[in-house]
Interface confidence: low
Amino acid sequence: SERCDDWGLDTMRQIQVFEDEPARIKCPLFEHFLKFNYSTAHSAGLTLIWYWTRQDRDLEEPINFRLPENRISKEKDVLWFRPTLLNDTGNYTCMLRNTTYCSKVAFPLEVVQKDSCFNSPMKLPVHKLYIEYGIQRITCPNVDGYFPSSVKPTITWYMGCYKIQNFNNVIPEGMNLSFLIALISNNGNYTCVVTYPENGRTFHLTRTLTVKVVGSPKNAVPPVIHSPNDHVVYEKEPGEELLIPCTVYFSFLMDSRNEVWWTIDGKKPDDITIDVTINESISHSRTEDETRTQILSIKKVTSEDLKRSYVCHARSAKGEVAKAAKVKQKVPAPRYTVELACGFGAT
C-alpha cells in the first residue's frame, strides 16, 4: 500500500476503561498530532478509518461495526463502545486518508475488571485537597459527551466500598462531592457511579479518583533549615572524613519546585576542584510536607578545606534561605612534657 505518515503506538495515551460500561475514545490524531480538527479534515474530503490488533495478536483487523445493538460504533472522530467487553482489549488505530494523503496513529486500549468495591488495575487520577481549608469540591471526571444535557443522570458517590450518605464532612451534590473540612481521614479512593438511560437501556459510568489531603497554603512557610545549625560544630583533623548534612523542611505547596544545594566558598561543588560528593534523600509527611537531606561528604579533608565556607541553600515558591555550617580544624591535644612544662617556666 502507499506510504502513510505513521505516528506509531502512542503509549502516552494508555486508555483504560471498565468492562461492561460505555466508552468513548477520540482519535488522538486531532488532539496531539495534526494541526487541524476532524471537521476541517472531513470538509476536505478525508475519511477516518478505524482498525485494531487484538491482545497477543499481530494481525490488524477491521472493527466490526455490525454488532447486535450497535455495540461498537463511530461518530465523527469518536469510537464508541456500548458497552465494552473484556476481549475488546488491544491496540486501536485511527487512519485519516484520501487518495493523496494518509496519516495514522495507534493507541492501547485496556478493558479492566473491577470488583464490588471498585478495586481494579485502573490507574487513578489524584486530586489534592488542602487540610482544614474550608469547603472544597471534587467533580466526577470524564463523563462529558456520554449523554445529552436533556438527560438527567443519577449519581451515587462512594468512599472505598461505602456509599456516601450521612457522612459528617463529605456531602454528595450531583456531579460534585463537597468536603466541608478535609481531614487526613478523607484520604482514599472516591468513586462516582453515573447511571443514565439510552435507547431503552441503562448504562453505568464508574469513575474513581484518589483524594490526598495535603498541607494547606494557610500553614505554608518558607523552607526551614534544621541542619546545619548554630549548635553543631564540625571539628575535624586533616585526613578525616567531613560529613555535613543539610536537612530542610518544605511545607507542601501545589506545583512548587523544592530545591536544596550546597555552595563551597560561594561556588557549586561541581565548579570546584576538591573531591566532594553529595547524596540526597527525600521523605514526606502524611500531608506531603517534604524533608530533603543532602549530605556533603569530603573523604579526606585538608586543612585548606577546613577553612572554606560551606553554605546550605534551600528554595521553594515561598522563598529562599541559606545557612552556613560551622567547620573548624581540631586543635591537637597538647603534649604535656614539652608544651605544659614550658608553660610552667621549666628549662
Partner: antibody, heavy 119, light 108 residues
Framework: QVQLLQSGAEVKKPGSSVKVSCKAS????????IDWVRQAPGQGLEWMGG????????NSAQKFQGRVTITADKSTNTAYMELSSLRSEDTAVYYC????????????WGQGTMVTVSS | EIVLTQSPGTLSLSPGERATLSCRAS???????LAWFQQRPGQAPRLLIY???RRATGIPDRFSGSGSGTDFTLTISRLEPEDFAVYYC?????????FGGGTKVEIK
C-alpha cells in the same frame, strides 16, 4: 500518645456470642479506622473488618459477614466487635488496631483479648 | 482476594547476621500499600514498615523494606537479640485486607 485498651478474656459456649470492646485514649478517635484482627493459637493474623467512627459504616471480610458486627460509640471513644454463633475454631486472641487513616497501616494495637470457645 | 505468601517459613540465623524475608502477592498490591509487622511471643504485633519502605516511628534503621508490584522484601541488616520473632507482611490496599503466613526468625 494514643493507646487502645481492650476488655478482658472471655470463655464462651459454642453457639453463643461475644462482644469485645476497644477504648481509645490520648488522641483523636473519630477520624481513624479501628480494625479487628484475630489470631488463633499458634496461627497467623486474620483481618475481620473495621469501622471509621466518624462515618459509622463498617465493612468486614466475607468470611465473617453475617456473624460479625462492628460498631463504635463516639461519645466514649470505644469500638466494639461482636461475633455470634461461636464455634471452637473461633478460639483466638482478638486484637483491635488503629488504621492510621482510611487506607493506612495498623500503627497502634490493643493488647489483645483471649476468647475461648469450649463446651 | 490478594494472597500473600511469605518465605522462608523459618529463618535460623545468629545475632549480627543479615536477615532477608520475602513476601509475594498473588496480584499487584494497590498503591504500594504493603506493611511489615513484628510479633514477639505473647505480645501484639508491632508496625515496622508501611508503604513498602517507610519506617514507622521509633523503628531502628537496621529494618528496611523494598519491592513493588507483587514482590516485597524486609531486610534486617544486623540481627540484634530482640529481633528474633515472627514477621508478617500485610497488604492494606484492597479489601479484604490480608496478611502473609509469617516468617519465624530464630536463633541458630
Amino acid at each position: 500518645q494514643v493507646q487502645l485498651l481492650q476488655s478482658g478474656a472471655e470463655v464462651k459456649k459454642p453457639g453463643s456470642s461475644v462482644k469485645v470492646s476497644c477504648k481509645a485514649s490520648g488522641g483523636t478517635f473519630n477520624i481513624y479506622a479501628i480494625d479487628w484482627v484475630r489470631q488463633a493459637p499458634g496461627q497467623g493474623l486474620e483481618w475481620m473488618g473495621g469501622i471509621i467512627p466518624i462515618f459509622g459504616t463498617a465493612n468486614s471480610a466475607q468470611k465473617f459477614q453475617g456473624r460479625v458486627t462492628i460498631t463504635a460509640d463516639k461519645s466514649t471513644n470505644t469500638a466494639y466487635m461482636e461475633l455470634s454463633s461461636l464455634r471452637s475454631e473461633d478460639t483466638a486472641v482478638y486484637y483491635c488496631a488503629r488504621n492510621g487513616a482510611t487506607s493506612d497501616a495498623f500503627d497502634i494495637w490493643g493488647q489483645g483479648t483471649m476468647v475461648t470457645v469450649s463446651s | 482476594e490478594i494472597v500473600l505468601t511469605q518465605s522462608p517459613g523459618t529463618l535460623s540465623l545468629s545475632p549480627g547476621e543479615r536477615a532477608t524475608l520475602s513476601c509475594r502477592a498473588s496480584q499487584s498490591v494497590s498503591s504500594n500499600y504493603l506493611a511489615w509487622f513484628q510479633q514477639r511471643p505473647g505480645q501484639a504485633p508491632r508496625l515496622l514498615i508501611y508503604g513498602v519502605s517507610r519506617r514507622a516511628t521509633g523503628i531502628p534503621d537496621r529494618f528496611s523494606g523494598s519491592g513493588s508490584g507483587t514482590d516485597f522484601t524486609l531486610t534486617i541488616s544486623r540481627l540484634e537479640p530482640e529481633d528474633f520473632a515472627v514477621y508478617y507482611c500485610q497488604q492494606y490496599g484492597s479489601s479484604p485486607l490480608t496478611f502473609g503466613g509469617g516468617t519465624k526468625v530464630e536463633i541458630k
